[in-house]
Interface confidence: low
Amino acid sequence: LEVSESPGSVQVARGQTAVLPCAFSTSAALLNLNVIWMVIPLSNANQPEQVILYQGGQMFDGALRFHGRVGFTGTMPATNVSIFINNTQLSDTGTYQCLVNNLPDRGGRNIGVTGLTVLVPPSAPQCQIQGSQDLGSDVILLCSSEEGIPRPTYLWEKLDNTLKLPPTATQDQVQGTVTIRNISALSSGLYQCVASNAIGTSTCLLDLQVISPQPRSV
């Protein structure tokens, strides 16, 4: 019995269906096929869980959190024992193992390993201003999404015709900050932060209005 090499890892957006591949070759009839799918969750590597089991011609549920969401992709018994997981959750991220036995066929590699990463698009980021908006001050524009896997990067743009930030601005796309030094009237306007990762983008807008000092009445 020989389990085929798996592609290594599967990535899927949260809420979508993941298909975890596992196939094997055997010299024996599939009369005594036994398949166990296990997961080592990323969130708790010390606590392996059973996902689904096929034994004695019957399917059995694994851990409670997989109930109603998991099944074999094809009719069992078969040499393709791939499974699907519906409505994927963040907690489904982990290393999945399929363990295959088909007596009397012994020997060979009987384990396949596939990583599953559940991706989450950036949630709507928060745009904020730190610092005084008085003429000549330094301000920091902040942008941050609560959620996002992989971790989002942040791109700030000034929504004028050029999409360029003012010349006195420095941007940190990892932290989501823009520092604008010595703000002037030209710094005023609408700024957009675009939070993005491999599977999505989300934006927020911020209106920066530089306050000019009022002329003092004599």
Partner: antibody
Framework: QVQLVESGGGVVQPGRSLRLSCAAS????????MHWVRQAPGKGLEWVAV????????YYADSVKGRFTISRDNSKNTLYLQMNSLRAEDTAVYYC??????????????WGQGTLVTVSS | ETTLTQSPGTLSLSPGERATLSCRAS???????LAWYQQKPGQAPRLLIY???SRATGIPDRFSGSGSGTDFTLTISRLEPEDFAVYYC?????????FGQGTKVEIK
């Protein structure tokens, strides 16, 4: 004077592709963001996509995301819309429009005359 | 996505009358980033108003825009024969930019 001339429209079968062009003249093309907007026969306007002055930023309507690609060649003063996996609901007159000088989100005064795309088997 | 609802669908008026067109947004339009366009049959749209109340270059002063947040209005103080057309509002405060379904101003 400012001129925008669309071309590339026609009749195409569902699932096929088409590329629209918009030739610009009378202004410094490389300084302006550009939009595509469409209008189904007898219907209202629907914004399709926008591209920044240098092509580094692009945004799409959800209805075309993943199927349409906006691009530009500033050396040729030309805006493009590559439309793949066309559907019957993509049937419309497609307009290119120049952003206003002060706000790249405002479509501005200048629009092409439109080119008709008909998706039909 | 911000949905814009225009009312009425059709406005039947005579030349010289005042036209009031309404545009209501499903959520607040950031910084009054709202535009109005005019479209005549067989023609491309023409920008009238941007920023809710700023008239575009060359637009007669009988066209005015007002409003903020979710409620916006286009007013044509005295209708001229060339003003009979379809009018669209559009928000550009958040992506995707969206248009209203249009109001047709027709001759009574």
């Amino acid at each position: 004077q400012v001129q925008l001339v669309e071309s590339g429209g026609g009749v195409v079968q569902p699932g096929r592709s088409l590329r629209l062009s918009c030739a610009a003249s009378g202004f410094t093309f490389s300084s302006y963001a550009m939009h595509w907007v469409r209008q189904a026969p007898g219907k209202g306007l629907e914004w399709v996509a926008v591209i920044s002055y240098d092509g580094s930023n692009k945004y799409y309507a959800d209805s075309v995301k993943g199927r349409f690609t906006i691009s530009r060649d500033n050396s040729k003063n030309t805006l493009y819309l590559q439309m793949n996996s066309l559907r019957a609901e993509d049937t419309a007159v497609y307009y290119c429009a120049r952003a206003s000088p002060s706000q790249w989100l405002v479509l501005g005064h200048y629009w092409g005359q439109g080119t008709l795309v008909t998706v039909s088997s | 996505e911000t949905t814009l609802t225009q009312s009425p669908g059709t406005l039947s008026l005579s030349p010289g009358e005042r036209a009031t067109l309404s545009c209501r947004a499903s959520q607040s339009v950031s910084s009054s980033y709202l535009a109005w366009y005019q479209q005549k049959p067989g023609q491309a749209p023409r920008l009238l108003i941007y920023g809710a109340s700023s008239r575009a270059t060359g637009i007669p002063d009988r066209f005015s825009g007002s409003g903020s947040g979710t409620d916006f209005t286009l007013t044509i103080s005295r209708l001229e024969p060339e003003d009979f057309a379809v009018y669209y509002c559009q928000q550009y405060g958040s992506s995707p930019w969206t248009f209203g379904q249009g109001t047709k101003v027709e001759i009574k």
